[in-house]
Interface confidence: low
Amino acid sequence: EVEKTACPSGKKAREIDESLIFYKKWELEACVDAALLATQMDRVNAIPFTYEQLDVLKHKLDELYPQGYPESVIQHLGYLFLKMSPEDIRKWNVTSLETLKALLEVNKGHEMSPQVATLIDRFVKGRGQLDKDTLDTLTAFYPGYLCSLSPEELSSVPPSSIWAVRPQDLDTCDPRQLDVLYPKARLAFQNMNGSEYFVKIQSFLGGAPTEDLKALSQQNVSMDLATFMKLRTDAVLPLTVAEVQKLLGPHVEGLKAEERHRPVRDWILRQRQDDLDTLGLGLQGGIPNGYLVLDLSMQEALS
């Protein structure tokens, strides 16, 4: 803590300007009025204060606002935000998307820090749900943000927010997360025509049920192998050879390269070999001709 000392004559700050960079830490503490600092926070960012000097400025704000800074100050914190602890941020009530953007901008290019995570958590909880504009902002700064949320947290994402999601935002999502997001995407894009719909829904298909994959197979969508390999195994297993052929279109030839990997491997094991042979790809491992095919639910119980 900086020792309390009287401000030298003539050094009392009338405004926040560049002359303050020449002040020693104790002079800043003694000569800068906290209320003045709060009203002129927008100027701090343009002045090349040292980290030590920023510590002093933060200390002054902490004394002025022991219960947490008002949003008018938070919005203009700039680089001073990097000095905040998660405990400081938990005292804030941030409601403006502009404030959130301003603070995320300060941390741009860096990994999500505990401070940023706390800020986002406070903001989203304050709003009650992850609305489209918030999601748009967060994924712009942190493409992996959506996949960092638990399925429970994702359940508060309204379907209309799905329009803000880009394919790269889902790269690190696991099947449980896609299970939650897929029905929302399906609802969000339901009024689009076939080809436009497939382009939008494609990234979410890791959460799609068998019925929806069957429906897509009737729409000439030509799903690529990368998307097919991300489908839920339990959704792929009931598909017939003809349905997979229609679903993949010209990409069906890629099955050969993936025949030892899930979900292709598991799917092959459920198909009749003579059906697989119709693809002309040399896929092996299907049920030999003449064998009894058990009901799928029975087969699950036996395996």
């Epitope: 209309s160 299970d179 009024n191 049920p209 019925e211």
Partner: antibody, heavy 119, light 111 residues
Framework: QVQLQESGPGLVKPSQTLSLTCTVS??????????WSWIRQHPGKCLEWIGY???????YTNPSLRDRLKISVDTSKNQFSLKLSSVTAADTAMYYC???????????WGQGTMVTVSS | QSALTQPASVSGSPGQSITISCTGT?????????VSWYQQHPGKAPKLMIY???NRPSGVSNRFSGSKSGNTASLTISGLQAGDEADYFC???????????FGCGTKLTVL
């Protein structure tokens, strides 16, 4: 022909948890085309959407009830359920389960079950 | 209370036409075509009559029609019959809250 049937106690004490189950017959709850919803109708006849569940377990609920509400699904029994905790007299209503299709349309409804909150 | 406004009651004689209005905002009725209408007889569950403003499910009489102008949706019943006497509810998707909202219903009396 898909049919829905609600079941559960008709009387619940204040501060307790209201539990209802909807059984789907004539079709599979695992059909990816539908959301399975709960809607209630207060004595003054206003209808209030409570929330829905997808066969995968994903839920979306009315923000005004979210803190007290849990909707779950049991695909093996072709059922979905509602639990509303800390009930008060304001939760007295006719509770309906319904099937929601594309376009936010409730095309099939159960016959409803009346729940009274009273000590 | 619902954010959708419906008249509490309307009446008409057999053979006549009546119209029930449902007024909302640009974030629900005005902004989207997700407007449905339901009929409810006493002691019964609601029944879907109109969806997406003007579409009729199979099995619903063509005497029932729907339309929309600005922030107001309307249900028109032509050739009124005694069996049409019931409560009628409008329902929309509200983009501001991202969930469905119902009107509080209109009681139709066939004189």
């Amino acid at each position: 022909q898909v049919q829905l049937q609600e079941s559960g106690p008709g009387l619940v004490k204040p501060s307790q948890t209201l539990s209802l189950t909807c059984t789907v017959s004539g079709g599979s709850i695992s059909s990816g085309a539908y959301f399975w919803s709960w809607i209630r109708q207060h004595p003054g006849k206003c209808l209030e959407w409570i929330g829905y569940i997808y066969y995968s377990g994903s839920t979306y609920t009315n923000p005004s009830l979210r803190d007290r509400l849990k909707i779950s699904v049991d695909t093996s029994k072709n059922q979905f359920s509602l639990k509303l905790s800390s009930v008060t007299a304001a939760d007295t209503a006719m509770y309906y389960c319904a099937r929601e299709g594309a376009g936010y349309v409730f095309d099939i409804w159960g016959q409803g079950t009346m729940v009274t909150v009273s000590s | 209370q619902s954010a959708l406004t419906q008249p509490a009651s309307v009446s008409g004689s057999p053979g006549q036409s009546i119209t029930i209005s449902c007024t909302g905002t640009s974030s629900d009725v005005g902004g989207y075509n997700y407007v449905s209408w339901y009929q409810q007889h006493p002691g019964k569950a609601p029944k879907l009559m109109i969806y997406e403003v003007s579409n009729r499910p199979s099995g619903v009489s063509n005497r029932f029609s729907g339309s929309k102008s600005g922030n107001t949706a309307s249900l028109t019943i032509s050739g009124l019959q005694a069996g049409d006497e019931a409560d009628y509810f409008c329902q929309v998707w509200d983009s501001s809250s991202d969930h469905v909202v119902f009107g509080c219903g209109t009681k139709l009396t066939v004189l």
